[in-house]
Interface confidence: low
């Protein structure tokens, strides 16, 4: 059994000033979601990621970038699996509110409107202010009426049928919401509408099927509505089943879809004894032959530091179903083989998510990686280069003596991903190169001095400092840096005078 | 509310180097979401983009201009950096800073950087 | 580099009409492409975010539609504070780029 998620802010609600931007996280011990005030076409402004941490947890992130009256509401954090049609969400929940001056009351939906009454029970006029210290009266033909009052969900009590008016004062300003309409309904008979399609998207020439089912009514009224209804394209059905309860099943069947067959398919429901009248919704898409559009979250050129663990993932939408690849240097990524994993995984009925793992990255993981989508209607590819990090090492350090000229060159090679900066250093008294103030940059501009690199390939390099001629004992250092790391090592260059008299003793 | 405010000497030398500073307030640079990029406006032309970085250093440069420019984030003062070496009179512009997630939502107000000796 | 090529360069329009700008892209770019307006002397301000979808703030007459290669930017019934710079951008294909612009001005 899970524990329930947490919120940060760990607060009951919080009052969030307008047009300034708030995140919620959630964190969970399986994978979380949200669930919040506004629909999907209002929530341009409402972005969900996740974030990871070291605390084992799941952590996902809620962010608004511009507080509005809209985003007033219940906040809810949950785990996924846990999520069912029949249940109240079951979560950890946070309630903002968002104060507007000229928004006395959360927008609503027209059906928010119609409240039902079922027998004598008690009902909610939801008419919730966007500042929780705002005083709110009800009123209805005779008056204002007695009810309590909860900011997060409106007035709760026992009405009797007809129109009722909420009313606000907010900074001398007076607020009126549009009349809630109570209606009372037995409850036997409420309408009990399911919308289904197995699928939303199709491509020219396929059969879209699409069926409303009412459930426990046998006295209803369907009609369709669908972008062919004019030319009496579609074919309707129905089926009445009876076992273990009364279930009467619409069917509309579209067959050789065409493009302007895309839009809303809409059932309405109305009971033939009663105006109850229930409006189910879906969009249909018909594409005149199949797509693949990939889009990647990473840029064409990708850098990795050495042993990190790193993630590329590729959003692709696609219909048919794409089959999803992986290749690197344009041969197909053995698995095995290496430390790198791919996985697909399907998100929405069109969506697939791809990722590219690289375990503990190494050298030999640079290079050009490529996904590649298709279907039977389209191919689609997305190529990056991926450049593995490495911190600078010094290959070798030597010295090359000029004979009798005293001239001497020192060759110092190193190797890095960015490809290393060489830097020399001389320490000219041999005695104190113990000491680092001993030791001088060597500046290219020193007479009787040369300093020159050479690029061996893209991840090696050669420098070269050049002495004229060296009258006495110095150290010479190389440092080769990038920006993962620095490496120096040292070497004694003696003069040729005192090398011949060491030669004869 | 994030505010983006672009700094630094509004006259270059010709074959000098060119560096701005952008100052990010009201939300954090190091914000795993979003890239900080740098576009700049010749008088009277359209937008060229230069090059972003993310937090964490990484940067992306616009080919035209890669060998002469460098971009760099210093987290601790919630600011980021655009060098542009050799300059010439062609690099004479407006330069914005701005913050972006594939698309620009935040900018800077401008900065005029004039290439003349 | 992908390439965005914006038609009209200039418009000259009365109040209260509807202007079309287009855009269009070298090369497919999905529906990563956003539209930019700017006022003389301001910085350009996010308008429309991929192709169609609407930005917090921005006035209703504003609106995108479009995928692929070709991408338009309406604004319906043109009001005197509109007068400015419309630019497309892209962001699917490294390096981005902008169209030339598309000066609006105000009969």
């Known amino acids: 059994q899970l524990s329930l998620p947490s919120i940060l802010p760990n607060e009951n609600e919080k009052v969030v000033q307008l047009n300034s931007s708030f995140s919620l996280r959630c964190f969970g011990e399986s994978e979380v979601s949200w669930q919040y005030p506004m629909s999907e076409e209002e929530s341009s402004d409402v972005e969900i990621r996740n974030e990871e941490n070291n605390s084992g947890l799941f952590v996902t992130v809620l962010e608004v970038s511009s507080a509005s009256a809209a985003h007033t509401g219940l906040y809810t954090c949950y785990y996924n699996h846990t999520q069912t049609e029949e249940n109240e969400l079951e979560g950890r929940h946070i309630y903002i509110y968002v104060p507007d001056p000229d928004v006395a009351f959360v927008p609503l939906g027209m059906t928010d409107y119609l409240v039902i009454v079922e027998d004598d029970d008690s009902a909610i006029i939801p008419c919730r202010t966007t500042d929780p210290e705002t005083p709110v009266t009800l009123h209805n033909s005779e008056g204002v009426v007695p009810a309590s009052y909860d900011s997060r969900q409106g007035f709760n009590g026992t009405f009797t049928v007809g129109p009722y008016i909420c009313e606000a004062t907010v900074k001398g300003k007076k607020f009126q919401t549009i009349p809630f309409n109570v209606y009372a309904l037995k409850a036997t008979s409420e309408l009990d509408l399911e919308m289904e399609a197995l699928k939303t998207v199709y491509k020219s020439g396929e059969t879209i099927v699409v069926t409303c089912a009412v459930f426990n009514n046998e006295v209803v009224d369907l009609q369709w509505t669908y972008p062919g209804e004019v030319k009496g394209k579609g074919i309707t059905m129905l089926e009445e089943i009876k076992v273990p309860s009364i279930k009467l099943v619409y069917t509309l069947t579209v067959p050789e879809a065409t493009v302007k067959d895309s839009g809303d398919y809409e059932c309405a429901a109305r009971q033939a004894t009663r105006e109850v009248k229930e409006m189910k919704k879906v969009t249909i898409s018909v594409h005149e032959k199949g797509f693949i559009e990939i889009k990647p979250t990473f840029s064409q050129l990708e850098a990795v530091n050495l042993h990190e663990v790193k993630h590329f993932v590729v959003e692709v939408r696609a219909y048919p179903p794409p089959r999803i690849s992986w290749l690197k240097n344009n041969l197909t990524l053995i698995e095995n083989l290496t430390e790198i994993t791919t996985d697909v995984e399907k998100i929405q009925e069109i969506r697939y998510r791809s990722k590219l793992k690289l375990i503990r990255a190494k050298e030999e993981d640079s290079g050009h990686y490529t996904i590649v989508a298709q279907n039977e209607d389209a191919v689609k590819s997305y190529t990056f280069e991926l450049l593995t990090q490495v911190p600078s090492s010094i290959l070798d350090l030597v010295d090359d003596h000029h004979g009798s000229t005293g001239g001497q060159t020192v060759r110092c090679t190193a190797e890095g991903t960015p490809l290393p900066d060489i830097e020399w250093m001389i320490c000219k008294d041999i005695k104190k190169c113990n000491n680092e103030t001993s030791w001088t940059i060597l500046a290219n501009n020193v007479s009787n001095i040369i300093t020159e690199i050479h690029s061996r390939d893209r991840s090696t390099v050669e420098g070269r400092v050049t002495f004229a001629k060296v009258e006495e004992t110095i150290a010479v250092r190389c440092l080769a840096k990038n920006l993962l790391g620095a490496e120096n090592r040292e070497l004694k260059l003696v003069a040729p005078t005192l090398r011949s008299e060491l030669t004869v003793a | 509310q994030l505010q983006l405010q672009e700094s630094g000497p509004g006259l270059v030398k010709p074959s000098e180097t060119l560096s701005l500073t952008c100052t990010v307030s009201?939300?954090?640079?190091?914000?795993?979401?979003?890239?900080w990029g740098w576009i700049r406006q010749p008088p009277g032309k359209g937008l060229e983009w230069i090059g972003t970085i993310y937090y964490s250093g990484s940067t992306y440069y616009n080919p035209s201009l890669k060998s002469r420019v460098t971009i760099s984030v210093d987290t601790s003062k919630n600011q980021f950096s655009l060098k542009l070496n050799s300059v010439t009179a062609a690099d004479t512009a407006v330069y914005y800073c701005?913050?972006?997630?594939?698309?620009?939502?935040?900018w800077g107000q401008g900065t005029l950087v004039t290439v003349s000796s | 580099e992908i390439v965005l090529t914006q038609s009209p360069d200039f418009l000259s329009v009365t109040p209260k009409e509807k202007v079309t700008i287009t855009c269009r892209a070298s090369q497919i770019i999905g529906s990563s492409l956003h539209w930019y307006q700017q006022k003389p002397d301001q910085s350009p301000n996010l308008l429309i975010k991929?192709?169609?979808q609407s930005v917090s703030g921005v006035p209703s007459r504003f609106s995108g539609s479009g995928s692929g290669t070709d991408f338009t930017l309406t604004l319906n019934s043109l009001e005197a504070e509109d007068a400015a710079t419309y630019y497309c951008?892209?962001?699917?294909?490294?390096?981005?780029?902008f169209g030339q612009g598309t000066k609006v001005e105000i009969k």
């Open positions: 009201g939300g954090s640079i190091s914000s795993s979401t979003y890239y």
């Open positions: 951008h892209q962001s699917t294909i490294l390096p981005w780029t």
């Open positions: 991929y192709a169609s």
């Open positions: 701005a913050r972006h997630h594939w698309v620009f939502d935040y």
